[in-house]
């Protein structure tokens, strides 16, 4: 009988092993080893045994010891098991962004490694084991599906192999893939809320606010705001899981008409959009026209208000009849009309919304000069030594200058308090003069002497 020692060997790939072959008889006719592996006999051997060194063992092998004794021929095999750790342990790339609530499939590929029976593949989240499977096939592919939550954002996933040769080799060989970091996101199914003016006047500033709740991670969200072809530049405010983008918008006459306001919130590989129609309009203040802004009294004046062709106007409390963009009326200018305001209000309906404008013009009426009995009495009788204030008011536009003189030299102190003396008595010629001409009026002052009895 032939014996081999050791009967089983686990050795690293490319390693060497010494194997002893022995025969049961003292003087075997022949004793040897059959193997394809490079072998070297270690001398000196014994009468009934030989030691061989097998080197560069690359794969599992079963070298055979044989002996030929008088009682017959026999053989025995030693089992060489080669171990080696995998050459490649790789976790398939994760999606750039993974939606929260959607299952993620982790896939690991393992190339090489032996013995496969002792090779286990694990999928890990950080150091937490998600799945443990045997390595099957070449390359071995292991997959597992895991639900994804917000707390998985930034988590590292990896794949690890374990070559467990215990108790033969007091060692556990581990190979770990490069970790992959998961980026998760949560974009709600609801579109962003867009608050903006429904109508916007040319050359005025409007404010647009776009907001969305339930975003994760909110810091990674991007907002795009545009009105027609005009990209807006919003200021973004972030909340816990919300954002609000606020932008000012100014529109020009070229953009007049209906424009689409678009707000898009992008997160991960998804976008939520809201569109709203904004009507851009031009609405100059109505024109108030007077045939002449300055006229002489008695002149006929046409006051006209004209507004946007689709507007409806009201001129000095009188609506256009029928309601429309033009209203006018005729008046004969009187002194009372001087400084009179003519106000025109216009209403324009833009996409169902009402916008209002107004304009005011003043009329100047030239009249006078005038000296009336009411404002400049022709006769005064005052007691001597009394305190009196001579009054004479000239009217006109432009305001006339007034002089009252006695004998062309002695002035009557108009509007001043005076002590009445004999000198004050007499007839004064009051003259009111403006660029429009002059009028005169005689004013007589009588002084009553006190009676002494």
């Amino acid at each position: 009988q032939t014996s081999v020692f050791p009967p089983e060997v686990i050795l690293p790939r490319g390693g060497s092993v010494k194997v002893n072959c022995s025969a049961s008889c003292d003087q075997p006719i022949s004793l040897g080893m059959e193997t394809p592996l490079p072998k070297k006999e270690i001398l000196p051997g014994g009468n009934n045994w030989k030691m061989y060194e097998l080197s560069n063992v690359q794969e599992d092998s079963q070298p055979m010891c044989y002996s030929n004794c008088p009682d017959g021929q026999s053989s025995a095999k030693t089992l060489l098991t080669v171990y080696w750790t995998p050459e490649r342990v790789e976790l398939a790339p994760l999606p750039p962004w993974q939606p929260v609530g959607k299952n993620l499939t982790l896939r690991c590929q393992v190339e090489g490694g032996a013995p496969r029976a002792n090779l286990t593949v694990m999928l890990l989240r950080g150091e937490k084991e998600l799945s443990r499977q045997s390595a099957v096939g070449e390359p071995a592919e292991v997959t597992t599906t895991v639900p994804v939550g917000r707390d998985d954002h930034g988590a590292n996933f990896s794949c690890r192999t374990e070559l467990d040769l215990r108790p033969y080799v007091l060692k556990l060989f581990e190979n770990t893939s490069a970790p992959h970091q998961l980026q998760t996101f949560d974009l709600p199914a609801t579109p962003p809320q867009l608050v903006s003016p429904q109508v916007l006047e040319v050359d005025t500033q409007g404010t647009v606010v776009c907001s969305l709740d339930g975003l994760f991670p909110v810091s990674e969200a991007q907002v795009s705001l545009a009105l027609g072809d005009q990209k807006l530049n919003p200021t973004i405010t972030y909340g816990n899981n919300s954002l609000s983008a606020k932008a000012s918008v100014k529109v020009t006459a070229e953009e007049e008409g209906t424009q689409q306001l678009l707000c898009g919130v992008m997160l991960g590989n998804q976008t939520q959009e809201t569109r709203q129609t904004v009507t851009i309009y031009s609405f100059p203040a109505p024109n108030v026209n007077l045939t002449k802004p300055e006229v002489s009294e008695g002149t006929e004046v046409i006051v006209e208000c004209e507004a946007h062709p689709r507007a409806k106007v009201m001129l000095n409390g009188v609506p256009a009849q029928p309601p429309g963009p033009r209203a006018q009326f005729l008046l004969k200018a009187t002194p009372e009309d001087n400084g009179r305001s003519f106000s025109c209000s216009a209403t324009l309906e833009v996409a169902g919304q009402l916008v209002h404008k107004n304009q005011t013009r003043e009329l100047r009426v030239l009249y006078g000069p005038r000296l009336d009995e009411k404002d400049c009495p022709g006769n005064w009788t005052w007691p001597e030594n009394s305190q009196q204030t001579p009054m004479c008011q000239a009217w006109g536009n432009p305001l006339p200058q007034l002089k009252c003189l006695k004998d062309g030299t002695f002035p009557l102190p108009i509007g001043q308090s005076v002590t009445v003396t004999r000198d004050l008595e007499g007839t004064y010629l009051c003259q009111a003069r403006s660029t429009r001409g002059e009028v005169t009026r005689e004013v007589t002052v009588n002084v009553l002497s006190p009676r002494y009895e």
Epitope: P319, P323, S345, T347, G352, L354
Partner: antibody, heavy 122, light 110 residues
Framework: QSVEESGGRLVTPGTPLTLTCTAS????????MSWVRQAPGKGLEWIGI?????NTYYASWAKGRFTISKTSTTVDLKITSPTTEDTATYFC???????????????????WGPGTLVTVSA | AYDMTQTPASMEVAVGGTVTIKCQAS??????LAWFQQKPGQPPKRLIY???TLASGVPSRFKGSGSGTQFTLTISGVQSDDAATYYC????????????FGGGTEVVVK
């Protein structure tokens, strides 16, 4: 000045129905007219408006379900494909006023009809 | 859209008491607000226009106030005839997709 609705009746779902509002004492050429409805036990719901120049605007829920048009004396509301949810009293209202102090026009339902009942039932 | 939020949805008041109904607009509607009273089987009746102007024939116990976004209807010295549903209505916009009326306030007089 008055408005009066007519045309309300019992219809089966999907059968188009046209309601008419007749104006008296004022010209529709100078006013905006609104349609408003009220389901049994519910609040007032604005449907839409037609302007003096025939522009129409609708509540978001009413778009595509209703069409407003007018002649010189009447305003029509067509319910294109009635459903049981359209069972309601339908009112027509003059919806345009002039504020004499500011000179501005504004929307103001100052004149209402008595309403006409539409029942949609299979 | 100019959303109109009316509070409360319903309320009870004793004869002689005071009713206060609030109406809030989601955006500035200046003073373009009207209040309506509606009784069962009748069309709405306009009580107040331009936020505070009393419509002709409306008793002076009805008072409207406010501007911008906050408006109030006050009924002082409530009478049994005031039992009705009250609605606010904005007069600023009739754009597509617009909201015109508040949800209504039912007033029950005890």
């Amino acid at each position: 000045q008055s408005v009066e609705e007519s045309g309300g009746r019992l219809v089966t779902p999907g059968t188009p129905l046209t309601l008419t509002c007749t104006a008296s004492g004022f010209s529709l050429n100078n006013y905006y007219m609104s349609w408003v409805r009220q389901a049994p036990g519910k609040g007032l719901e604005w449907i839409g408006i037609i302007s003096d120049s025939d522009n129409t605007y609708y509540a978001s829920w009413a778009k595509g379900r209703f069409t407003i048009s007018k002649t010189s004396t009447t305003v029509d509301l067509k319910i294109t494909s009635p459903t049981t949810e359209d069972t309601a009293t339908y009112f027509c209202a003059r919806d345009w006023s002039l504020d004499s102090s500011s000179g501005y026009y504004y929307y103001d339902m100052d004149l209402w009809g008595p309403g006409t009942l539409v029942t949609v039932s299979a | 859209a100019y959303d109109m939020t009316q509070t409360p949805a319903s309320m009870e008041v004793a004869v002689g008491g005071t009713v206060t109904i609030k109406c809030q607009a989601s955006q500035n509607i200046h003073s373009w607000l009207a209040w309506f009273q509606q009784k069962p089987g009748q069309p709405p009746k306009r009580l107040i226009y331009k936020a505070s102007t009393l419509a002709s024939g409306v008793p002076s116990r009805f008072k409207g106030s406010g501007s911008g976004t906050q408006f109030t209807l006050t009924i002082s010295g409530v009478q049994s005839d005031d039992a009705a549903t009250y609605y606010c209505q904005q007069g600023y916009s009739r754009s597509d997709g617009e909201h015109v009326f508040g949800g209504g306030t039912e007033v029950v007089v005890k």
